[in-house]
């Protein structure tokens, strides 16, 4: 009886199991009982990343510099090009089709995680004892100055945006 299912890396056509084309190659003609599946390598700037019966290869992704993109990994006949963003920018999606400027953490917030090409800056509020007085994509919350270790006293309390102000101790006469 003719087959109704085929092995892995095969496909059923005309009551026959034909070999799929390997990654990096496209289908030119189905197999017959006299000749194997005819496959051809993908052209320059094309790829296919699976065992397939595609008659056309996919175009490599274009990393458009106008969108802040650059090539992270050049595509091959078996893999797509991987784009990433220029320094200071990050991808807007997992597919990295465009970039946006890294977010800065406002005063009162510090950088919890520095941005990468694929993820934005993560900010966190400065907890008690810490402050940030700048808008930055790199600066963490800094601890308040310890007046005691400088043999000084707090003259003005710190906030999440300002450091404490130290001053000399009042001397009792």
């Amino acid at each position: 009886e003719p087959p109704t299912a085929c092995r892995e890396k095969q496909y059923l056509i005309n009551s026959q199991c034909c070999s799929l084309c390997q990654p990096g190659q496209k289908l030119v003609s189905d197999c017959t009982e006299f000749t194997e599946t005819e496959c051809l390598p993908c052209g320059e700037s094309e790829f296919l990343d699976t065992w397939n019966r595609e008659t056309h290869c996919h175009q490599h992704k274009y990393c458009d510099p106008n969108l802040g993109l650059r090539v992270q990994q050049k595509g091959t006949s078996e893999t797509d090009t991987i784009c990433t963003c220029e320094e200071g920018w990050h991808c807007t999606s997992e597919a990295c089709e465009s970039c946006v400027l890294h977010r800065s953490c406002s005063p009162g917030f510090g950088v919890k995680q520095i941005a990468t090409g694929v993820s934005d800056t993560i900010c966190e509020p400065c907890p008690v004892g810490f402050f940030s007085n700048v808008s930055s994509a790199f600066e963490k919350c800094h601890p308040w100055t310890s007046c005691e270790t400088k043999d000084l006293v707090v003259q003005q309390a710190g906030t999440n945006k300002t450091d404490v102000v130290c001053g000399p101790q009042d001397r009792l006469r």
Epitope: Q16, E33, F34, T35
Partner: antibody, heavy 117, light 107 residues
Framework: EVQLLESGGGLVQPGGSLRLSCAAS????????MSWVREAPGKGLEWVSG????????YYADSVKGRFTISRDNSKNTLYLQMNSLRAEDTAVYYC??????????WGQGTLVTVSS | DIQMTQSPSSLSASVGDRVTITCRAS??????LNWYQRKPGKAPKLLIY???SLQSGVPSRFSGSGSGTDFTLTISSLQPEDFATYYC?????????FGQGTKLEIK
């Protein structure tokens, strides 16, 4: 035992026709693709035509396309090759062969076709 | 059509010799190649399929190798019954095509 027996060869004039037969026995004929291969005097082997098993698709070498027709009668376990518009260059011994996994594992003894005036 | 070129066209060797016949395809055919043995007055016999797989019942002194465009048939130790004509045949593209044959003769 697998056996393939060709018949129908002979002398024919250019432009004439001939029908070759191949009687198969010893295996389930309908389950196998079959083909015709020829060998011209002093030349090598040339694949002429093939016919699939279940789908029954037919395939031809460019040199015979449009002139030769392959067919099969599974009820009679017989393979045929209808040859029309014969030319001198078709002179050869014609073999029928059984196909398995893209190879011809059993062949007949051949029948001679001579095209001459 | 794919052209198959065998070399040499003829070859003289002695019993016990190791013999290699080569077959070159005009374009890549992966490993889609068969080898046949042909003796005068007899039907061809399938020796090797898929470039390197030994057909059932064929002695192990026969072996095949290669992929892409270059293939070889090796007989490790020639026996008297091995003197014959050998053909390669591709099945990577329609139509299947044969090499012109290599005639192996007794030296």
């Amino acid at each position: 035992e697998v056996q393939l027996l060709e018949s129908g060869g002979g002398l024919v004039q250019p432009g004439g026709s001939l029908r070759l037969s191949c009687a198969a026995s010893g295996f389930t004929f309908s389950s196998y693709a079959m083909s015709w291969v020829r060998e011209a005097p002093g030349k090598g082997l040339e694949w002429v035509s093939g016919i699939g098993s279940y789908g029954g698709g037919t395939y031809y070498a460019d040199s015979v396309k449009g002139r030769f027709t392959i067919s099969r009668d599974n009820s009679k376990n017989t393979l045929y090759l209808q040859m029309n518009s014969l030319r001198a260059e078709d002179t050869a011994v014609y073999y029928c062969a059984r196909y398995v996994n893209f190879g011809m594992d059993y062949w007949g003894q051949g029948t001679l076709v001579t095209v001459s005036s | 059509d794919i052209q198959m070129t065998q070399s040499p066209s003829s070859l003289s060797a002695s019993v016990g010799d190791r013999v290699t016949i080569t077959c070159r395809a005009s374009q890549s055919i992966s490993s889609y190649l068969n080898w046949y043995q042909r003796k005068p007055g007899k039907a061809p016999k399938l020796l090797i399929y898929a470039a390197s797989s030994l057909q059932s019942g064929v002695p192990s002194r026969f072996s095949g190798s290669g992929s892409g465009t270059d293939f070889t048939l090796t007989i490790s130790s020639l026996q008297p019954e091995d003197f014959a004509t050998y053909y390669c045949q591709q099945y990577g593209r329609n139509p299947p095509t044969f090499g012109q044959g290599t005639k192996l003769e007794i030296k």
